[in-house]
Amino acid sequence: QRLPRMQEDSPLGGGSSGEDDPLGEEDLPSEEDSPREEDPPGEEDLPGEEDLPGEEDLPEVKPKSEEEGSLKLEDLPTVEAPGDPQEPQNNAHRDKEGDDQSHWRYGGDPPWPRVSPACAGRFQSPVDIRPQLAAFCPALRPLELLGFQLPPLPELRLRNNGHSVQLTLPPGLEMALGPGREYRALQLHLHWGAAGRPGSEHTVEGHRFPAEIHVVHLSTAFARVDEALGRPGGLAVLAAFLEEGPEENSAYEQLLSRLEEIAEEGSETQVPGLDISALLPSDFSRYFQYEGSLTTPPCAQGVIWTVFNQTVMLSAKQLHTLSDTLWGPGDSRLQLNFRATQPLNGRVIEASFPAGVDSSPRAAEPVQLNSCLAAGD
């Protein structure tokens, strides 16, 4: 699957149990930020803001296009589903010990900037990707991954940390964003929705995908994560969208089949090593890139985000397993664990391919609105 080159279609469904966008930051021309879905109240809420449910059903995605495994979102029907009158499922957490409201959560108090001031920063993640506005950068070469094909032993630690499922990665997984931009993979984790409700963090032209994988990397210039936090390029995350396909994804099944063992928050298990690169799209040459932040507290900025143009396919059953197995703090299901999209505030998303050019009949003169910032690199 490849991400579409989008036209001005209506955004497709999906809602967030994350936080609303920071206020006072929408001071740029409207074309910089696409219309976003209405998100439940959360991180940046002001008193008196309307609490909109804004949860819509994701339309089924099963068309085949001429190009093998290629899907354009503009080919999909737009489905207007009624808003879910219920609160987002991850909004109300009951803690096992008392009613402490001071730890962070998706879609609820406290506001994230109270947990970490960086969450109110101007260059936050995730964002809505508008391919038409992306700057084509020929200097963005194919990503290089080395050592990602792991043997079964030693085993890896898979943990339900209460806000995601995280796989610890051993030393030796090397990734290069380009010459001199070298990183070591630390861990990967996933973000997802709930039944009929997509849960990717990034969106494309307002379309939210069923789920998203993040592989977190530390720059080789730093020995520890805490040293790299907030430093430009200190951390890099590879992100890919997960979509529904007709077949079971055998790579993901190696993890998903173990989720029942770690249903409880904080629990962990050991899984055999696997080919980590098989969890990512096969096309390392076509991607979007921008500088943003961690998508959970502490929300540190300076993170280089690389979002693959190609998507990864999982079966409907696998996506259901992902969204319906784990439990978070208290008695709440671990679902809808994604943050609302944040304003670009002048940032330009770069593309390693001419994403703004479309051969669709509906595309008028394709115009590349932004120029590549890294052309001289």
């Epitope: 109270r114 970490s116 940390n161 209460g162 630390l186 520890r224 928050e265 962990e268």
Partner: nanobody, 127 residues
Framework: QVQLQESGGGLMHDGDSLRLSCAAS????????MGWFRQAPGKEREFVAA????????YYADSVKGRFTISRDNAKNTVYLQMNSLKPEDTAVYYC????????????????????WGQGTQVTVSS
């Protein structure tokens, strides 16, 4: 940056109870899993107890299970270790540690997975 300061240590007798506290500076306390480790003279640092970022899950070393209780108050940026039925073999320097969610995701039992450490507080249990 998170800075940790332990307190509450002291000289105790066999069977006594004691509560250690670990105060964290910085406003990101609730994003960290927290752990207690201890190191006796001439021995390696060993895991004692840990608690997840939300407080929803706790973990204990077999040697302290049923006697020690870890808890946290995110509003006060503090994690506690309630130690009951103390034994002479509990004598050690007790360290508080914080594990950030974006680290390598090591086991709660693994000291290498913790990003920040306190200076330690001495607990001595005499028979």
């Amino acid at each position: 940056q998170v800075q940790l300061q332990e307190s509450g240590g002291g000289l105790m007798h066999d069977g006594d109870s004691l509560r250690l506290s670990c105060a964290a500076s910085g406003r990101t306390f609730s994003t960290y899993a927290m752990g207690w480790f201890r190191q006796a003279p001439g021995k390696e640092r060993e895991f004692v107890a840990a608690i997840s970022w939300s407080g929803g899950s706790t973990y204990y070393a077999d040697s302290v299970k049923g006697r020690f209780t870890i808890s946290r108050d995110n509003a006060k940026n503090t994690v506690y270790l309630q130690m009951n039925s103390l034994k002479p073999e509990d004598t050690a320097v007790y360290y508080c540690a914080a594990e950030g969610i974006y680290n390598s995701g090591s086991s709660y039992h693994d000291a290498n997975g913790y990003d920040y450490w306190g200076q330690g507080t001495q607990v001595t249990v005499s028979s």
